[in-house]
Amino acid sequence: KFSKQSWGLENEALIVRCPRQGKPSYTVDWYYSQTNKSIPTQERNRVFASGQLLKFLPAAVADSGIYTCIVRSPTFNRTGYANVTIYKKQSDCNVPDYLMYSTVSGSEKNSKIYCPTIDLYNWTAPLEWFKNCQALQGSRYRAHKSFLVIDNVMTEDAGDYTCKFIHNENGANYSVTATRSFTVKDEQGFSLFPVIGAPAQNEIKEVEIGKNANLTCSACFGKGTQFLAAVLWQLNGTKITDFGEPRIQQEEGQNQSFSNGLACLDMVLRIADVKEEDLLLQYDCLALNLHGLRRHTVRLSRKNPIDHHS
């Protein structure tokens, strides 16, 4: 339960995180489990501990094994295990399964490939990206921060992608590579000017003072995965978050994909304990995407409770 697998290549940097978490001020001790030998904290060592992190700079095949981390908190010690395997570098181009990180899938509209584990390292842009050992070149490929963006993804873009970057530790540079598979979802999608299904334009919604009320803004944007699409509510032309009325909150509904393949979004506006002044506000349902913005306006009116007295 408190164990995590980590792997790397010989002569590359590898940084491993303790599976147990604590406060920044807690001490973390690391041990090599087979010998129960303490891992030093001095950075002059090739393998050293730095708080929650265990650093192999660089890693060697002989470093493989189970490492124990103990997070020392005021009331009890939390023990975790890092199962580390360091592999020899392959001479050929194939990346074996045991070196692969989780597969990601993308489509024509969404093709980000994140470089695995990069957040653990002290690196500077740009990243280098390779597919099947070939450096990626051309305007379709953009290395942005810690991920690769592929424009106009095609089925041929599926494959194994390797990111390569340099980790810097006290002025010394170490290479790191990480590989993951990318699959392409075949989606014949398109995008349209937003169509608001609800509410109707200039709809009057009846509400009861003192009760809760919900308004749903629902819009469709096309078919398949949409690159940019959003629905939101505004009060008197102001974003809900900026309006500053805690009784009125918006909440994202379910992303919907109907049987006809249309991609639709819902945003529910919840008004708790409706007050008189809420009837004076203008409620705008906004739907926007790359084509533009559509707005439907709703106003509230008082619903007189049914008189049950004879």
Partner: antibody
């Protein structure tokens, strides 16, 4: 900059469940645990539990054991708190707060109203 | 569970006054392993989210004005506002940051005369 954005207000009936989300940005989600704290109207803050975001291990406060479930989705950098068998005294603002020496980062709060 | 008791529950002071709030814990919050006192102080303005002022009993969170200071060790702790300002109108909470369940004091409401 670090931001924790919570889901919107909820109105629930007694006996129902509520699930509140907390989306983190501006830092590496799995580097810090996430706490959940609630505050009933006019009352003190009350710690409900926390989750180790790296391995998904939750720890719950005794007052909530059996009723609360804290989970996380690392791919979405989001933590969730689900409270079941709601009663009127669960009406409160629910906050997520990032673990640290003290809670330096809080979500904006989610008002949960339990009313028949 | 560690009980946190704050006093006073409310106070009224003038702008420029020195304000002191005390907090007592039912068990020591000192961790001998690193000599840290795991106590935090928060400020909560009406209708707002709590804001961390002090952690480790005496370390001021970045961006917090220097008029706020924390002291104490073991079971007795103090939050001091050296010169009260109008924007300090709020409720102040201490918190056991030492062991589960993390517990909060009942709060001290500070009003401006």
């Amino acid at each position: 900059q670090v931001q924790l954005v919570q889901s919107g207000a909820e109105v629930k009936k007694p006996g129902a469940s509520v699930k509140v989300s907390c989306k983190a940005s501006g830092y590496t989600f799995i580097n810090y645990g996430m706490n959940w704290v609630r505050q009933a109207p006019g009352q003190r803050l009350e710690w409900m539990g926390w989750i180790n975001t790296y391995i998904g291990e939750p720890t719950y406060g005794d007052n909530f054991k059996g009723r609360v479930t804290i989970t996380r989705d690392t791919s979405a950098s989001t933590a969730y708190m689900e409270l079941s068998s709601l009663r009127s005294e669960d009406t409160a603002v629910y906050y997520c707060a990032r673990e640290g020496d003290g809670f330096a980062y809080w979500g904006q709060g989610t008002l949960v109203t339990v009313s028949s | 569970d560690i009980q946190m008791t704050q006093s006073p529950s409310s106070l009224s002071a003038s702008v420029g006054d020195r304000v002191t709030i005390t907090c007592k814990s039912s068990q020591s919050l000192l961790y001998s392993g690193n000599q840290n006192n795991y106590l935090a102080w928060y400020q909560q303005k009406p209708g707002k989210v709590p804001k961390l002022l002090i952690y480790g009993a005496s370390t001021r969170e970045s961006g917090v004005p220097s008029r706020f200071s924390g002291s104490g060790s073991g079971t007795d702790f103090t939050l001091t506002i050296s010169s009260l300002q109008p924007e300090d109108l709020a409720t102040y909470y201490c918190q056991n940051d030492h062991s589960y369940p993390y517990t909060f004091g009942g709060g001290t409401k500070v009003e401006i005369k």
